[in-house]
Interface confidence: low
C-alpha cells in the first residue's frame, strides 16, 4: 500500500537497518526509497533532541510485516518508502539548504559567485555527491564564496550541522542536468583496471550497469560473464572508480564486458528494472517466502507484488500430480542483488518489476493494440519504419525497426542490389505510404552495416543495421522497440505480430496502409519439416500457421516480428524469407534477433 503522508512528532519503533543523514524528511524518504531494503523511516529534526549530533539523522527501517508500531516523539517525522507507490521514482533533489553544513570528504575547493554556480560545478564534477557553499557574509573572510565539493562512500553526508551563512545541496546528476560526457556503450571483450570499490553478483552486463548507475561512487564497471575462466569470479560485477573519473587503462579480456555508469546521462533517468528471465539459473539470497506458482511469469508477478521481494527463483514442477505448479522462491539480500548465481540448475530466476518506475524508453507502454482487422492504425507500431530507395525512382524497399535513436535493424538481403547509403531514406511514424510526399521529413542513412557472414537469406545471418545520419527524437509515432535479452533466449512468446506494407498474396503490389497479422511462433523442428531443402538454424525463428494464411510476404522484408512479453514489446524476429506467401506448412522465416544481440551491441555500441 502506498502511504504518502509524513507523520509529525512520531517515531517508528524498532526495525532499524542503518542510519544516514538528510537535510529534511523529504530527502530522508528519497534515501529510504532508493535503499534496497528500507520500507519505513524516521527523521530527527532539530527539536527532536538537545544533542545536535542526533539532528538530521535519517533512520532507515525494515519490517517483515511492512509496518512498525508508531510512538509519539517530539521533533521526529516518520513515513514510508515510495517503493510501494506506482508513481515515478526519482533521486533528483534540487533543493538548497540554507545554514546547513553537509559533511563529507572535501576533495575540491574553489571560488564561486553563488550557490547555484557551486551546485552546477558539483553536477559537472564526476566525483561530487553534494556541496557546501560559504556565502559572502560567512564569518571567516578567507573562506567567503568558497565552493566545497564533497563525496562519501554512501553518497549521503556523514553528518549535518547548523552553520550560519552556508548553503548546501546535492549534485543534480540524477536530474539529468550534468554536462559530463555520457557514454552508453558496453564494450565486449574489455576489462577496465582501476580501483574496485564493490563487487556484486549480476546475471548480465546490463544489470551490472544498472547497479553501477545506482551506486553513488561507481563510475564504470567490468562484468565477468558466466563463461569467465575462474569459476569463483563468474557473474561478478566489479564496480569501479578512478581519481580522474575515467578508466586509466583497459585490457582485452575475452568473456568480460565493460561500460560506464549512466548516472550523469542527460535526458534519461537510469533504469533499475530487469525484466529478463534467466533460465537454468538459481539466484541465491535470503528466503522471504516459498509459494506455488504456475509459471516463472507468475512467480515474477508474485515477487513484484511482495514489497520486500527483490529477486526470485522459480523451480518448475517435476511431477504432474500437483497440477503442474512449481515452487516460487521469493528472495532478498542486503544490497538487492543475489549473493551467488548458480547455473545448470533447471530453475528460472529474475528480479522484481517493482522498480520499473524509471523510464526506459523502449519499455514504456504504448497505445493498446487494435484487436481484429488487418490494417494498423496510427501509433500502433511506432518502431516500424519504411525504408525507401530513391534511385532510379523512389519506392518502398523494405521494412525495419527502430532500436535506438540512430539505429534501424533490418534484413541484409534488402541490400543485395543497393550498396550506397546515400540513395536510402528512412521514414518513421508512417501509416500510409501515400503520406510520403516530396517534403515529408526523413532520416538519411550514414552507414549500412551488413552481417559479415551473410551470403543469402536462406543461409541465415540475414540481418543489417542502418546508422542514421541524425538522431531521432522519440514521439508517440516513432519509438524504439526493445531487443530481446539473451536471458530470454528460451521464452515462448505467445503474442507475436508481423507488420509491413508488403504484398498480400504472391502476385500483388505494395500496400498503402501498414498491414498486421498475429502469428504464432513454432519450433525449429516443426518449421524444418516444411523446408526439407533448407536448413533451419538456431539463428532463425519461424512463425505462421500450419494451414497457411497469415504470413509475411514480398515487401515486408526487414520488418519486425514484434512479441509482447511482461507488458514489454520485444523485437523477436526480422522478416527474412519463406516459400511463397502464406502457403500451407511453409511458415515465414525470420532472423532470430536474440542470437544477434552481441553483434548488434558490438556494432552500435562498440569502439
Amino acid at each position: 500500500e502506498c502511504v504518502t503522508t509524513l507523520f509529525q512528532d512520531a517515531c517508528f519503533k524498532g526495525g532499524d537497518i542503518t542510519v544516514a543523514f538528510a537535510p529534511n524528511a523529504k530527502h530522508c524518504q528519497i534515501i529510504c526509497t532508493h535503499h534496497p531494503r528500507c520500507l519505513l523511516f524516521t527523521f530527527m529534526t532539530e527539536s527532536s533532541s538537545e544533542d545536535p549530533t542526533k539532528w538530521y539523522t535519517c533512520i532507515l527501517k525494515d519490517s517483515v510485516t511492512e509496518t512498525l508500531p508508531m510512538v509519539n516523539m517530539t521533533g521526529a517525522i516518520s513515513g514510508y518508502s515510495s517503493k510501494q507507490c506506482l508513481h515515478h521514482i526519482s533521486a533528483c533533489s534540487k533543493d538548497m539548504y540554507v545554514d546547513l553544513n553537509m559533511k563529507g570528504m572535501n576533495y575540491n575547493s574553489s571560488l564561486a559567485q553563488s550557490a547555484r554556480e557551486c551546485q552546477q560545478r558539483c553536477t559537472d564534477d564526476t566525483h561530487c555527491h553534494f556541496f557546501t557553499f560559504a556565502t559572502r557574509h560567512f564569518p571567516s573572510i578567507k573562506d567567503r564564496n568558497t565552493c566545497l565539493l564533497k563525496n562519501t562512500q554512501t553518497g549521503t553526508p556523514t553528518s549535518i550541522t547548523k552553520l550560519h551563512e552556508v548553503v548546501s545541496g546535492f549534485s543534480l546528476k540524477s536530474c539529468g542536468l550534468s554536462n559530463l560526457a555520457c557514454i552508453r556503450d558496453i564494450f565486449p571483450r574489455t576489462a577496465f583496471v582501476d580501483i574496485t570499490i564493490d563487487t556484486v553478483m549480476a546475471p548480465d552486463p546490463f544489470v551490472c550497469r544498472s547497479i553501477c548507475t545506482h551506486h553513488p561512487s561507481c563510475l564504470f564497471f567490468t562484468f565477468l560473464s558466466e563463461e569467465w575462466p575462474t569459476a569463483s569470479e563468474r557473474n561478478l560485477c566489479l564496480l569501479k572508480t578512478s581519481s580522474s573519473g575515467l578508466p586509466s587503462a583497459r585490457f582485452r579480456k575475452n568473456r568480460a564486458f565493460s561500460g560506464f555508469s549512466l548516472q550523469h546521462c542527460q535526458h534519461s533517468v537510469p533504469v533499475f528494472c530487469h525484466s529478463s528471465f534467466y533460465r537454468n539459473t538459481d539466484f541465491l539470497g535470503e528466503e522471504l517466502d516459498i509459494v506455488d506458482a504456475d509459471s516463472h511469469e507468475a512467480c515474477q508477478k508474485t515477487c513484484t507484488n511482495s514489497i520486500r521481494c527483490q529477486f526470485f527463483t522459480y523451480s518448475p514442477s517435476q511431477e504432474s500430480c500437483n497440477g503442474g505448479k512449481g515452487k516460487c522462491y521469493l528472495k532478498l539480500s542486503a544490497n538487492g542483488s543475489p549473493t551467488k548465481i548458480l547455473h545448470g540448475t533447471g530453475s528460472i530466476s529474475g528480479y522484481t518489476l517493482r522498480l520499473c518506475k524509471m523510464d526506459n524508453v523502449c519499455t514504456t507502454k504504448i497505445k493498446t493494440r487494435i484487436v481484429g482487422g488487418t490494417q494498423s492504425v496510427h501509433g500502433e507500431w511506432p518502431w516500424q519504419i519504411t525504408l525507401h530507395v530513391t534511385s532510379p525512382t523512389q519506392r518502398h524497399l523494405c521494412g525495419g525497426a527502430i532500436i535506438g535513436n540512430q539505429w534501424i535493424l533490418t534484413a541484409a538481403h534488402c541490400f543485395n542490389e543497393v550498396k550506397s547509403p546515400n540513395v536510402l531514406r528512412v521514414y518513421s511514424g508512417i501509416l500510409n505510404q501515400s503520406e510520403i510526399k516530396e517534403d515529408t521529413s526523413f532520416f538519411g542513412v550514414q552507414e549500412i552495416i551488413i552481417h559479415d557472414q551473410y551470403e543469402k537469406a536462406e543461409s541465415g545471418y540475414d540481418i543489417a543495421l542502418l546508422k542514421l545520419e541524425t538522431a531521432m527524437n522519440y514521439t508517440d509515432s516513432q519509438w524504439p522497440i526493445c531487443l530481446p535479452s539473451k536471458g530470454d533466449r528460451n521464452v515462448m512468446y505467445t503474442e507475436c505480430w508481423v507488420t509491413g506494407w508488403g504484398y498480400r498474396k504472391l502476385r500483388d503490389k505494395i500496400q498503402n496502409t501498414l498491414q498486421k497479422a498475429k502469428v504464432p511462433l513454432m519450433t525449429n523442428e516443426e518449421c524444418q519439416a516444411g523446408y526439407r531443402e533448407h536448413r533451419i538454424t538456431s539463428k532463425m525463428v519461424c512463425a505462421g500457421y500450419r494451414e497457411g494464411g497469415k504470413d509475411a510476404c514480398k515487401g515486408d522484408s526487414g520488418g519486425p516480428l514484434s512479441c509482447k512479453h511482461n507488458e514489454v514489446w520485444h523485437l523477436v524476429g526480422i522478416t527474412s524469407w519463406g516459400e511463397g506467401c502464406g502457403q500451407r506448412e511453409r511458415p515465414g522465416v525470420y532472423s532470430n534477433v536474440v542470437e544477434y544481440v552481441d553483434w548488434i551491441l558490438e556494432k552500435t555500441q562498440g569502439p
Partner: antibody, heavy 116, light 107 residues
C-alpha cells in the same frame, strides 16, 4: 546529411564587434552541442567555446569576457559574438558538432580580418 | 586550464614508414583525447576520440594510445595522402584545448 556552414563579415575594424552565424542541417541543435574554434593564419587551432544542446555555454577562459555564444533552435543557427576586436583576432573561424567532447563534423570556416 | 603540448612541430617521414606523434597534457585527462588531421585549405577531420576509438570511415592504419598525461597517435604505414598537420585535443574538461599541431612532411 550533416552540414555546418559559417557566415561572417570578412573584414572588421579594430575595437569593433564580430558576429558569425553557423547554420546547420541534417541534425537538431537540441540534441547536439556546437563548438567554435579559430585558426590564425599559419597557426594552430584555438578552442573558443561551445553551446550545449540545452543552451548552456562554456568559454575559453582567456576570451570569456569578450565572447558570447547563443542559438536559435528553430532556425538551426548558432551565433558567435565577440567584441573589442584586435588585429590578433584575425583568423579562420570554424563551427563544429560535438561528439563525446570531440568534433565529428566541421564547417568550412569563415575568414575574419581585423584591420583598419 | 589544461594545456596540451605536442613537442614536435615537424616530423619527416617516407611512404610506408611507421610514425608516432606524441602529446602531453598538463594534468590528468584520463583517456579523453582526440586526434585531428588537417590538410591545407581544409577543415580539420576527426580521426580518433577517447584516445583509441576510430571515427567512422577512418582507416585502421591510424591508431591512438595512452592515458593520464601522455598520448601517442600512430600511423602504421604512412600513405602520401597522410601528409598533413595533426592536432591532439583534450575533451576531458571544458574549456577544451588543442595541442600546437605536428606537421607530417615528406623526408
Amino acid at each position: 546529411q550533416v552540414q555546418l556552414e559559417e557566415s561572417g563579415p570578412g573584414l572588421v575594424a579594430p575595437s569593433q564587434s564580430l558576429s558569425i552565424t553557423c547554420t546547420v542541417s541534417g541534425f537538431s541543435l537540441t540534441g547536439y552541442g556546437i563548438y567554435w574554434v579559430r585558426q590564425p593564419p599559419g597557426k594552430g587551432l584555438e578552442w573558443l567555446g561551445m553551446i550545449w544542446g540545452d543552451g548552456r555555454t562554456d568559454y575559453n577562459s582567456a576570451l570569456k569576457s569578450r565572447l558570447s555564444i547563443s542559438k536559435d533552435n528553430s532556425k538551426s543557427q548558432v551565433f558567435l559574438k565577440m567584441n573589442s576586436l584586435q588585429t590578433d583576432d584575425t583568423a579562420r573561424y570554424y563551427c563544429a558538432r560535438d561528439y563525446y567532447g570531440s568534433k565529428d563534423y566541421w564547417g568550412q570556416g569563415t575568414t575574419l580580418t581585423v584591420s583598419s | 586550464d589544461i594545456v596540451m603540448t605536442q613537442s614536435h612541430k615537424f616530423m619527416s617521414t617516407s611512404v610506408g614508414d611507421r610514425v608516432s606523434i606524441t602529446c602531453k597534457a598538463s594534468q590528468d585527462v584520463s583517456t579523453a583525447v582526440a586526434w585531428y588531421q588537417q590538410k591545407p585549405g581544409q577543415s580539420p577531420k576527426l580521426l580518433i576520440y577517447l584516445t583509441s576509438y576510430r571515427n567512422t570511415g577512418v582507416p585502421d592504419r591510424f591508431t591512438g594510445s595512452g592515458s593520464g598525461t601522455d598520448f601517442t597517435f600512430t600511423i602504421s604505414s604512412v600513405q602520401a595522402e597522410d601528409l598533413a598537420v595533426y592536432y591532439c585535443q583534450q575533451h576531458y574538461k571544458t574549456p577544451y584545448s588543442f595541442g600546437g599541431g605536428t606537421k607530417l612532411e615528406r623526408l
